[in-house]
């Protein structure tokens, strides 16, 4: 297995939040004498070995902060200790794990490493890590909010934002698909009897429409937008797209946008078919997110 | 530079105990496994136990479970091994050694200055 | 408990000679999630502390001179002086870390 860091540099703001997130993939032995540890924790610039030194978070070593999986059990970690120092490690069925810091400082600038071991019943460890760098900054020349720059084997040549790898987008929709889908089968029986229209079913997937444009020389990546809502139609031109195998890399990630999908418009809201129809739009894409993203 | 000193040689009766210390420098003392191991004179290495500092945790060869104590001391980034009921078999020179493990086990990169036990009466 | 046998258990070779050491572990100490052996080799020099020289099996610890070679898979492990100095006078240990922490009785290398 490897380890991805999607960004190589978070930018942020005194006082704001930020998640730094890494993503496992690869062959994954699941046997039951096999047990994942991912955690986190801070290394030196200027190493031979990067993040090879190794210091603690906040004041919490990578022990407080791991995320630990047995053959087939859920990550759980000492959750408690880290929300007290403002930290919160996650992780979800994807490979995606993450760390979220909150209310940062200037202290909290650094060289963060993401970690995943291996180890084997009565066995050492395999360990691969993956790093990225935290600027947080004050003053005038702060940005707004955390602007997040691609790493380098992921940066775009040309100088608009980079597309998304293959990976981050199977695993944003995966799992946007599986909240979606378990949302709206939790709704549905309410749906009949309930006589006001139903909640709009929305897929949020990042959008590159509030992309925060840098005079860096690398720019934030697509990925860093907020989430947008897709129209019904947008659906199954998106999922179709994605079955084929394009690499998404325009403003929903759908190559040629314009000739297939329509400008993106609000959702709909109707109740009865309309909304049936729409659970079934979602449904065909989610199904086809999860055949091309299960090829990977 | 990363760097463990030991404390002096101690000269006991057979029965009593002894703890011996072990202070890092250099690096993130809660961050990494500290490791002792028995040297008898002339002899090879024997790994008696480890203890993660963060948590204060340790782990120990079970030939050495009922003789050995492991602690830490945060505040002052050091390490400490009781030996208790000693015997002339624990006449020694004794070192505590840094391995760089997450959770399993891994080499030693950094080794103390060693400590000689000497059990007579 | 994995077993480390060395041998020989001593040698005597003048300066400027090659040297080689063994080790055998009683299992496999190679992982095969990475294919790397969970070996080291450490120098002890008369009245220090052992030194790292080598993990791995044969990945050289940095400022250890290149006359230094480790070598070998699975359970057969060697240590290798291309060209012995005098300074190499030494107690040489083999440490397993695959499944806790096992270590060979040593070679003991004198200089004619």
């Known amino acids: 297995f490897k380890v991805a860091t999607l960004y190589s540099l978070y930018v942020c703001p005194e006082g704001q939040n930020v998640t730094l997130t890494c993503r496992v993939f690869g062959p994954v032995d699941k046997g039951h004498d096999v047990t994942f540890y991912k955690t986190w924790y801070r290394s030196s610039r200027g190493e031979v070995q990067t993040c090879s030194e190794r210091r603690p978070i906040r004041n919490l070593t990578f022990q407080d902060l791991h995320l630990h999986h047995g053959g087939h059990q859920a990550a759980n970690t000492s959750h408690d200790l880290a929300q007290r120092h403002g930290l919160e490690s996650a992780s979800d069925h994807h490979g995606n794990f993450s760390i979220t810091m909150r209310n940062l400082t200037l202290l909290d600038s650094g060289l963060y490493c993401c970690l995943v071991v291996e180890i084997r019943h009565h066995h050492s460890e395999h360990r691969v890590h993956g790093a990225m760098e935290l600027q947080v900054q004050t003053g005038k020349d702060a940005p707004s909010s955390c602007v997040a720059y691609p790493s380098s084997s992921q940066e775009s040549e040309s100088k608009g934002p980079s597309s998304c790898p293959f990976w981050v987008i199977c695993s944003l929709l995966s799992s946007s698909c599986t909240q979606t889908l378990f949302g709206t089968l939790a709704l549905s029986p309410q749906a009949h009897r309930n006589p006001s229209p139903p909640p709009p079913l929305l897929l949020h997937i990042p959008s590159a429409s509030s992309l925060v444009q840098s005079p860096e020389a690398h720019s934030p990546s697509i990925c860093s937008g907020v989430s947008a809502p897709l129209a019904s139609l947008e659906w199954l031109c998106l999922g179709s797209h994605l079955w084929l195998g394009k690499v998404p890399h325009d403003r929903y990630w759908v190559p040629q946008a314009a000739k297939c999908c329509p400008s993106h418009q609000p959702p709909m809201t109707s109740e009865g078919w309309g909304s049936r129809i729409q659970l079934l739009q979602i449904s065909v894409f989610c199904v086809s997110v999860f055949l091309r993203c299960s090829l990977l | 530079q990363v760097q463990l000193k030991q404390s002096g040689a101690e000269l006991v009766r057979p029965g009593a105990s002894v703890k011996l210390s072990c202070k890092a420098s250099?690096?993130?003392?809660?961050?990494?496994?500290i490791n002792w191991v028995k040297q008898r004179p002339g002899q090879g290495l024997e790994w008696i136990a480890r203890?993660?500092?963060?948590?204060?945790?340790?782990y120990y060869n079970e030939k050495f479970k009922d003789k050995a104590t492991l602690t830490v001391e945060k505040s002052s980034s050091a390490a400490y091994m009781q030996l208790s009921s000693l015997t002339s078999e624990d006449s020694a020179v004794y070192f505590c050694?840094?391995?760089?493990?997450?959770?399993?086990?891994?080499?030693?990169?950094?080794w103390g200055t060693g400590t000689t036990v000497t059990v007579s009466s | 408990n994995i077993m480390m046998t060395q041998s020989p258990s001593s040698l005597a070779v003048s300066a400027g000679e090659k040297v080689t050491m063994s080790c055998k572990s009683s299992q496999s100490v190679l992982y095969s999630s990475n294919q790397k052996n969970y070996l080291a080799w450490y120098q002890q020099k008369p009245g220090q502390s052992p030194k790292l020289l080598i993990y791995w099996a044969s990945t050289r610890e940095s400022g250890v001179p290149d006359r230094f070679t480790g070598s070998g898979s699975g359970t057969d492990f060697t240590l290798t002086i291309s060209s012995v100095q005098a300074e190499d006078l030494a107690v040489y240990y083999c440490h397993q870390y695959l499944s806790s922490y096992t270590f060979g009785g040593g070679t003991k290398l004198e200089i004619k």
């Open positions: 203890i993660f500092p963060g948590s204060g945790n340790a």
């Open positions: 050694a840094r391995d760089d493990s997450f959770y399993g086990y891994w080499y030693f990169d950094v």
């Open positions: 250099g690096y993130s003392f809660t961050d990494y496994y």
